[in-house]
């Protein structure tokens, strides 16, 4: 359990991950969770993964914004876009290749401040 | 409901550029959270994917096409569009246009009824 | 590519048959395939998405099952308006690749 808070004092969020891992051929969740916010248009969820310059996904103004998704990602993520309102950052991960392992970043921009965390992410063939 | 609807020429000269647009009515493009696909179908055979394109103008491409493909969008009109360059007779086919079910599930509902581009001189 | 493999590619059938499609997938797709209905001159219809999810709208003699490189579609009583071309889908990985097709005929 990772628990992250925003960098701007008064303006932080507190934002939490799950270290988890998925099986390689599978779909994955990468788990985050955020304080919630009363309007879905001032939330913003940005997943970043270390060393990928695109973004792994973003969600902001209600809807998906994938024009910065780095290709390798592209058609196979997805948020739970009914949930993110009650504060469900989550993130599903289509078709889990080994090279998705690694360390992401959940971040997250709403009304009341910002904050972030990591999450490590492993792969493999688990049963 | 979303419903969508091809236009364009039927009948495109060798080396030429098929030119399609695909209107989307019942439903803005600029929504989000789906892909909008262009497929076509040579006569009497199977289905092939050519490529994709989210509202933002992120595209992605066959690439057994690519180097001749290019998918646009302009969400002022509702539309996205198709241009297929050097077309041989081999190109010749029903042009669909399609929605993703989801940015994740890409299985492929509603389509446009389909136009058929003929490559002939 | 992802090579999508449908058998039979025809099959004769009568009303009120058990009908089975199968599709098989040249590598592991997970539960990432749709299946189609196509009729001539028209485009084709979704039926299941995610290898088991029936489409809104589609009648309940329609199933879809399997999961990683192999499935199938059964009609379980076929009907007068079945008889048309199915084709299974893997949007497991780009690019998006289309089964050969499978034209049910009357017997």
């Known amino acids: 359990l990772i628990i992250g808070f925003g960098i701007s004092g008064r303006h932080s969020i507190t934002v939490t991950t799950v270290a988890s891992a998925g099986n390689i051929g599978e779909d994955g969740i990468l788990s985050c969770t955020f304080e919630p916010d009363i309007k879905l248009s001032d939330i913003v969820i940005q997943w970043l993964k270390e060393g990928v310059l695109g973004l792994v996904h973003e969600f902001k103004e209600g809807k998906d914004e994938l024009s910065e998704q780095d290709e390798m990602f592209r058609g196979r993520t997805a948020v739970f876009a009914d949930q993110v309102i009650v504060g469900n950052a989550s993130l599903r991960l289509k078709n889990v290749q080994l090279t998705d392992a690694g360390t992401y970043k959940c971040y997250i921009i709403t009304s009341k401040g910002k904050g972030n965390a990591n999450l490590e992410y492993k792969t493999g063939a688990f049963s | 409901q979303v419903q969508l609807q091809e236009s364009g020429p039927g009948l495109v000269k060798p080396s030429q550029t098929l030119s399609l647009t695909c209107t989307v009515s019942?439903?803005?493009?600029?929504?989000?959270?789906?892909?909008w696909s262009w497929i076509r179908q040579h006569p009497g055979k199977g289905l092939e994917w050519i490529g994709n394109?989210?509202?933002?103008?992120?595209?992605y491409y066959n690439p057994s096409l690519k180097s001749r493909v290019t998918i646009s969008v302009d969400t002022s009109k509702n539309q996205f569009s198709l241009k297929l360059s050097s077309v041989t007779a081999a190109d010749t086919a029903v042009y669909y246009c399609?929605?993703?079910?989801?940015?994740?599930?890409?299985?492929?509902?509603?389509w446009g009824q389909g136009t058929l581009v003929t490559v002939s001189s | 590519d992802i090579q999508m493999t449908q058998s039979p590619s025809t099959l004769s059938a009568s009303v009120g048959d058990r009908v089975t499609i199968t599709c098989r997938a040249s590598?592991?797709?997970?539960?990432?395939l749709a299946w189609y209905q196509q009729k001539p001159g028209k485009a084709p219809k979704l039926l299941i998405y995610?290898?088991?999810s029936l489409e809104s709208g589609v009648p309940s003699r329609f199933s879809g099952s399997g999961s990683g490189t192999e499935f199938t579609l059964t009609i379980s009583s076929l009907q007068p308006d079945d008889f048309a071309t199915y084709y299974c889908?893997?949007?497991?990985?780009?690019?998006?690749?289309f089964g050969g097709g499978t034209k049910v005929e009357i017997k």
């Open positions: 394109i989210y509202y933002s103008g992120s595209t």
């Open positions: 995610k290898a088991s």
């Open positions: 889908q893997q949007d497991n990985s780009y690019p998006y690749t």
């Open positions: 019942g439903g803005s493009i600029s929504s989000g959270g789906y892909y």
């Open positions: 399609a929605r993703g079910l989801s940015t994740i599930d890409e299985a492929f509902d509603p």
């Open positions: 590598q592991s797709i997970s539960s990432w």
